[in-house]
């Protein structure tokens, strides 16, 4: 009866063909291939991307949809015009031919066309709705992308300003470093110059010291010669006086015995008959060198050579190696006899060492070592002690075995610090040890919790600075 055929042409339009008898009607309608089919749903709440989607692509698609809409509208209008024209022609023809059944066919065709039109219209409405949805979605996407872009731009600006700040800071620091380097170079140069000047000065001082030492030696020799001459003269005068005072009738005129003129220690002085406390001149055997020492002729049988005394803080004990070597202070008051003399003396025979101590509360104590000697200067006057007795502690406050002697300019202790500088005074420091009788002198009520006082730990404990100390030696067999 009637036959519908649907096919595709080269430009992608749908071709509708109606065949009826000798008449055939062909309608070309556009296909909505670019539209999203309703079977593929659009997810509106998808995760927002950081970078925009292909913006141009979306715009193109939108334009294509608009074009399709326009085309569809035009086609509908043409179709309506065409149907109207056709209907008119057909009606004229039917009237002319008066063919009754042809009218029925035309009405059927018209109906089909109207149905087709309605279908197209419905499809177009759907497309229009889809286009609106798509447009809204695209607008939202564009807004999101715009926000994202703004955010990124802000971040970039922030980072750029941060980079600029860092670059400024870096250049400032570079300048500062360069300035410091320049300053450092200048300082090094000035230090080098000062060092050179000091070296020149030191060498000059060394030569002056050498000359002075030579002069001292000469003066000492001259002095001893003069003393001998003086002694000889005195002896001669005494002899003459004795001879003159002796009557002519005397059968055996006697010459007064010449007294022993040199004593090595106070024990010899005591044995020679001088039994009163006081300052005496001592001389080592086979030596012209003399030292003035205080002799205690009363304590414990007498004959004690005082090698150290502290009593009132009148003498500074923060002295150099050389001063501790030769001695310093006042023998009738505070003094240090001298390491060289004591070393030589205690290596000639066996000596005992007695240390007498006084606190601020009126108490007294002592430590007695039955054997004491000092090594030579080459061995830093190391102290050697044996056999402790006494009331100033059962344990020796002078570290055992003995340590080398240290002064402010000769660090021979076992400490990572410099004990002589930290605790003041020269002593046989350990690290730094339980004693220092050459520390700072502190008066009463200021003598506790002291880090650098006159210390004898095993009697008064740490931090207690004593009122008085005396170190004395005497031959072991006295």
């Amino acid at each position: 009866y009637n036959n519908f055929r649907k096919s595709m042409d080269s430009i992608g339009k749908k071709q509708y063909q109606v065949q009826h008898g000798s008449c055939s009607y062909t309608f070309l309608l556009p296909e909505m291939d670019n539209c999203r089919s309703s079977s593929s749903p659009y997810v509106s709440n998808a995760v927002q991307r950081d970078a925009p989607l292909e913006y141009d692509d979306s715009v193109q698609r939108l334009q294509v949809l608009e074009n399709i809409m326009e085309n569809n509208t035009q086609w509908l209008m043409k179709l309506e015009n065409y149907i109207q024209d056709n209907m008119k022609k057909e009606m004229v023809e039917i009237q002319q031919n008066a063919v009754q059944n042809q009218t029925a066919v035309m009405i059927e065709i018209g109906t089909n066309l109207l149905n087709q039109t309605a279908e197209q219209t419905r499809k177009l409405t759907d497309v229009e709705a889809q286009v609106l949805n798509q447009t809204t979605r695209l607008e939202l996407q564009l807004l999101e992308h715009s926000l994202s872009t703004n955010k990124l731009e802000k971040q970039i600006l922030d980072q750029t300003s941060e980079i600029n700040k860092l670059q400024d800071k870096n250049s400032f620091l570079e300048k500062k470093v360069l300035a410091m380097e320049d300053k450092h170079i200048i300082q090094l140069q000035s230090i080098k110059e000062e060092k050179d000047q000091l070296q020149v000065l030191v060498s000059k001082q060394n030569s002056i010291i050498e000359e002075l030492e030579k002069k001292i030696v000469t003066a000492t020799v001259n002095n001893s010669v003069l003393q001998k001459q003086q002694h000889d003269l005195m002896e001669t005068v005494n002899n003459l006086l004795t001879m003159m005072s002796t009557s002519n009738s005397a059968k055996d005129p006697t010459v007064a015995k010449g007294e022993q003129i040199s004593f090595r220690d106070c024990a010899e002085v005591f044995k020679s008959g001088h039994t009163t406390n006081g300052v005496y001149t001592l001389t080592l055997p086979n030596s012209t060198e003399e030292v003035k020492a205080y002799c205690d002729m009363e304590a414990g049988g007498g004959g004690w050579t005082i090698i150290q005394r502290r009593e009132d803080g009148s003498v500074d004990f923060q002295r150099t190696w050389k001063e501790y070597k030769v001695g310093f202070g006042n023998p009738s008051g505070e003094y240090w006899l001298g390491n060289e003399f004591v070393s030589q003396l205690t290596n000639q025979q066996r000596y005992v060492l007695k240390i007498h101590l006084k606190d601020w509360e009126g108490n007294e104590a002592y430590s007695l070592y039955e054997h004491f000697y000092l090594s030579s200067e080459e061995l830093n006057y190391r102290i050697h002690l044996k056999g402790l007795t006494g009331t100033a502690g059962k344990i020796s406050s002078i570290s055992q075995p003995g340590n080398d002697f240290s002064t402010k300019d000769a660090d021979n202790d076992k400490c990572i610090c410099k004990c002589s500088q930290m605790l003041t005074g020269g002593w046989w420091f350990d690290a730094c040890g339980p004693s220092n009788l050459n520390g700072m002198y502190y008066p009463q009520r200021q003598n506790t919790n002291k880090f650098n006082g006159i210390k004898w730990y095993y009697w008064k404990g740490s931090g207690y600075s004593l009122k008085g100390t005396t170190m004395m030696i005497r031959p072991a067999g006295f």
């Epitope: 350990d430 690290a431 339980p434």
Partner: nanobody, 129 residues
Framework: DVQLVESGGGLVQPGGSLRLSCAVS????????IGWFRQAPGKEREGVSA????????YYADSVKGRFTISSDNSKNTVYLQMNSLRPEDTAVYYC??????????????????????WGQGTLVTVSS
């Protein structure tokens, strides 16, 4: 003048805790080591713990390891001894004392008692039920 003042002692039951404080004046903790010592009746004074604030080093006697903790607050010039799991044998007078941080023998880490020259008056800790 250097002063050390202990506080925080008292009576506590076995297993209990106490925190002793040692307030130091006249010196800065950066240059000194502070030690805690104790002396029980009829016994010698013994070292308990010590701290060197400059390097953050600490020392503990074997008898208190794991129970006592020493710490310092340099801004307050104060050293603390936190004592936990106390035992009756911890009963003693506790003293804090100071020593110049540099007064160390080569190769040694800590100081003999006689090197501590500044002492506090002590605070009594009694551990008894």
């Amino acid at each position: 003048d250097v002063q050390l003042v202990e506080s925080g002692g008292g009576l506590v039951q076995p297993g209990g805790s106490l925190r002793l404080s040692c307030a130091v004046s006249g010196i800065t903790l950066d240059d000194y080591a502070i030690g805690w010592f104790r002396q029980a009746p009829g016994k010698e004074r013994e070292g308990v713990s010590a701290i060197r604030s400059s390097g953050g080093s600490t020392y503990y006697a074997d008898s208190v390891k794991g129970r006592f903790t020493i710490s310092s607050d340099n801004s307050k010039n104060t050293v603390y001894l936190q004592m936990n799991s106390l035992r009756p044998e911890d009963t003693a007078v506790y003293y804090c004392a100071a020593v110049p941080a540099g007064r160390l023998r080569y190769g040694e880490q800590w100081y003999p008692i006689y090197e501590y020259d500044a002492w506090g008056q002590g605070t009594l800790v009694t551990v008894s039920s």
